[in-house]
């Protein structure tokens, strides 16, 4: 289960991502932002410092909207 | 081919200061996170350190943090591992790998290693 | 952190034997172990990694089970060229720790 306000390296953080993301799925980076204009990684956000359950779940896929 | 090949041991005396290095090539360097790993003479295997693809992230084992510093330089295909504040339980043939360690990958290449040795 | 011990530390086979080597990890870790061999003199090789793939270039008479805890190597048919020392190693958490290496010697 998810510890809060930790850091999460190795499998650990891919199994934290597949229980936060569920079926949906997740990705180990987010396209850049017009803003940033580079891309972000779960690695940099959450090995390397501490993150928290809303910054994980901005790494699940969004699921496929149905018809 | 994919290889790896470390440099810079040598006997250097209790206190004292080494730089090691290993040359990548034949795969992109810059895509995958490095690894230093020890080996004592006669003993099993100890990670040292890992620094993540783009060198803005790193860890240490307790063993050398504080005295140990891993880095690279991508555009030269090179990773380092200062050492500094050097013991005797440092000794070890010390071996650059590569592996998706962060994501839980294992090390799937190895350099051949350089020795260190620690002593008065 | 995660201890890993491996047993037996040192075995004695002969060629074409079946040989076994188990590791165990202190607290669960999926199937995030790999196995490493290494000659005498030699760097470590990569033979097995999330407890079960085989490496590419790796003989098929290796392979790997496990989960959680407890993991196994086993050599179907031991060659030559495989008296070698093994080592199991996890990569669910940092420190990434090894096991204290297992001896395989010709009988």
């Known amino acids: 289960a998810y510890r809060p306000s930790e850091t999460l390296c190795g499998g650990e953080l891919v199994d934290t991502l597949q229980f936060v993301c569920g079926d949906r799925g997740f990705y180990f980076s987010r396209p850049a932002s017009r803003v940033s204009r580079r891309s972000r990684g779960i690695v940099e956000e959450c090995c390397f410092r501490s993150c928290d359950l809303a910054l994980l779940e901005t790494y699940c896929a969004t699921p496929a909207k149905s018809e | 081919e994919v290889q790896l090949l470390e440099s810079g041991g040598g006997l250097v005396q209790p206190g004292g200061s080494l730089r090691l290095s290993c040359a990548a090539s034949?795969?992109?360097?810059?895509?995958?996170?490095m690894d230093w790993v020890r080996q004592a003479p006669g003993k099993g295997l100890e990670w040292v350190s890992v620094?993540?693809?783009?060198?803005?992230?790193?860890i240490y084992a307790d063993s050398v943090k504080g005295r140990f510093t891993i880095s690279r330089d991508n555009s030269k295909n090179t990773l380092y591992l200062q050492m500094n504040s050097l013991r005797a339980e440092d000794t070890a043939m010390y071996y650059c790998?590569?592996?998706?360690?962060?994501?839980?990958?294992?090390?799937?290449?190895w350099g051949q290693g350089t020795m260190v040795t620690v002593s008065s | 952190d995660i201890q890993m011990t491996q047993s037996p530390s040192s075995l004695s086979a002969s060629v074409g034997d079946r040989v076994t080597i188990t590791c165990r990890a202190s607290?669960?870790?999926?199937?995030?172990l790999n196995w490493y061999q290494q000659r005498p003199g030699k760097a470590p090789r990569i033979l097995i990694y999330?407890?079960?793939t085989l490496q590419s270039g790796v003989p098929s008479r290796f392979s790997g089970s496990g989960s959680g805890t407890d993991f196994t190597l086993t050599i179907s048919s031991v060659q030559p060229e495989d008296f070698a020392t093994y080592y199991c190693?996890?990569?669910?958490?940092?420190?990434?720790?090894f096991g204290g290496g297992t001896k395989v010697e010709i009988k």
């Open positions: 790998a590569r592996g998706r360690t962060l994501y839980g990958g294992a090390f799937d290449i």
């Open positions: 034949g795969f992109t360097f810059s895509k995958y996170e």
């Open positions: 620094i993540s693809s783009s060198g803005g992230g790193t």
């Open positions: 607290q669960p870790i999926n199937t995030y």
């Open positions: 999330t407890s079960s």
């Open positions: 190693q996890q990569s669910y958490s940092f420190p990434l720790t």
